[in-house]
C-alpha cells in the first residue's frame, strides 16, 4: 500500500472574530474504523501541537472540553473551526490524519494552511 | 531462553500522553530493528512480527513510564532496547540510552 | 561502507520497496550511542543539526548528501520510513575514514 496523502488549502483568512475554518481531506490506503486528527502550528522550526481529537469513522469529531477547535466528520473528509485567534496566532496550521485501527497504521501529513488573522480595530470613542 | 522480562523507560520534560513511543532494538554489531510502538492513550498498539505474540508493549500515562514485557525469549531477542519518542511531525527525535539484554543458556 | 576523507562529500543512498512519499527520516550512530535524528519528511533538518546535512528525494528514492566531511561525521547512517507500521529502518551505512 502507498502513503497517505492529506489535502488542506493553502490560505485562509480569520473572520474578525477570530475564527477559522478549512477542511482536512485524506486519501485513505485502508479501511480504518479510527481516525485521529491533529492540528499542529508550525512556527520557524518549532512545531507543536494546537488540538487533537479521535474519532470513529460514521461518528462525530470529539475535541476536548477547553479545547479551541471544534470539527466535525464526513467520510474522508474532516472540517475544522479554530476559534479564539488573534493577529500573534498568524502562522502556518498544518493537519496530520493517523489511521490507529485497525493494524497497519498509516500517517498522513498536510502541507499545512497559512492563517492570516488580524486583530478587529477598537471601536471609536462616540459622543452618542 | 524461554524467560521473561520486563524493560521500562521514563520520560520526563514533555507532554508523554501527546506522543507514540517506540521500542527499538539493535542486536550486538548489527543494525537497528523496528520493535513496537504503543500510541497516546495506550489502546493502539503495533508489533514487529519478529516480537508478535512474545513481546507486549504499554505505558502509564500518569507515571509517564513505557513498558515491553518480553516472553519466550530467544538468544535472537539479545540486543540493546532503545524507547523513542515520535515527534509531532512523525519521526523519533528523542531516544533513551539503551538497556542491554542478553538471552544465553 | 563508504571510506572517505575529512573535507570530502558523502553522498548516501536510500531505497524503499514500495513509495513512502516524504515520511522518511535519516538518523546517525556513534558507537555506543543513541541514534540521533538528523533529517525528517525526506528533506528537513532536525533542530540543532548543521546545515552540512541535507536530504533529497521522494517516493522510494532518497539521498542524504554531507558537503564537506568533518571528523565527526564518520559513523553510522540509518533510513527509516515513518508513514505506516512496520516502521522498517535501513540496513545502514557506515561512513569511515579513508
Known amino acids: 500500500c502507498k502513503a497517505m496523502h492529506v489535502a488542506q488549502p493553502a490560505v485562509v483568512l480569520a473572520s474578525s472574530r477570530g475564527i477559522a475554518s478549512f477542511v482536512c481531506e485524506y486519501a485513505s490506503p485502508g479501511k480504518a474504523t479510527e481516525v485521529r486528527v491533529t492540528v499542529l502550528r508550525q512556527a520557524d522550526s518549532q512545531v507543536t501541537e494546537v488540538c487533537a481529537a479521535t474519532y470513529m469513522m460514521g461518528n462525530e469529531l470529539t475535541f476536548l472540553d477547553d479545547s479551541i477547535c471544534t470539527g466535525t466528520s464526513s467520510g474522508n473528509q474532516v472540517n475544522l473551526t479554530i476559534q479564539g485567534l488573534r493577529a500573534m496566532d498568524t502562522g502556518l496550521y498544518i493537519c496530520k490524519v493517523e489511521l490507529m485501527y485497525p493494524p497497519p497504521y498509516y500517517l498522513g501529513i498536510g502541507n499545512g494552511t497559512q492563517i492570516y488573522v488580524i486583530d478587529p480595530e477598537p471601536c471609536p470613542d462616540s459622543d452618542f | 531462553p524461554g524467560r521473561s522480562l520486563r524493560l521500562s523507560c521514563a520520560a520526563s520534560g514533555f507532554t508523554f500522553s501527546s506522543h507514540g513511543i517506540h521500542w527499538v532494538r539493535q542486536a550486538p554489531g548489527k543494525g537497528l530493528e523496528w520493535v513496537a510502538v504503543?500510541?497516546?492513550?495506550?489502546?493502539?498498539?503495533d508489533y514487529a512480527d519478529s516480537v508478535k505474540g512474545r513481546f507486549t508493549i504499554s505505558r502509564d500515562n500518569s507515571k509517564k513510564t513505557l513498558y515491553l514485557q518480553m516472553n519466550s525469549l530467544r538468544a535472537e531477542d539479545t540486543a540493546v532496547y532503545y524507547c523513542a519518542r515520535v515527534a509531532p511531525l512523525g519521526p523519533l527525535d528523542y531516544w533513551g540510552q539503551g538497556t542491554l539484554v542478553t538471552v544465553s543458556s | 561502507t563508504l571510506s572517505l576523507s575529512p573535507g570530502e562529500r558523502a553522498t548516501l543512498s536510500c531505497r524503499a520497496s514500495?513509495?513512502?512519499?516524504?515520511?522518511l527520516a535519516w538518523y546517525q550512530q556513534k558507537p555506543g550511542q543513541a541514534p540521533r535524528l538528523l533529517i525528517y519528511g525526506a528533506s528537513s533538518r532536525a533542530t540543532g543539526i548543521p546545515d552540512r546535512f541535507s536530504g533529497s528525494g521522494s517516493g522510494t528514492d532518497f539521498t542524504l548528501t554531507i558537503s564537506r566531511l568533518e571528523p565527526e561525521d564518520f559513523a553510522v547512517y540509518y533510513c527509516q520510513q515513518y508513514g505506516r507500521s512496520p516502521f522498517t529502518f535501513g540496513p545502514g551505512t557506515k561512513v569511515d575514514i579513508k
Open positions: 514500495q513509495s513512502v512519499s516524504s515520511y
Open positions: 504503543i500510541w497516546y492513550d495506550g489502546r493502539n498498539k
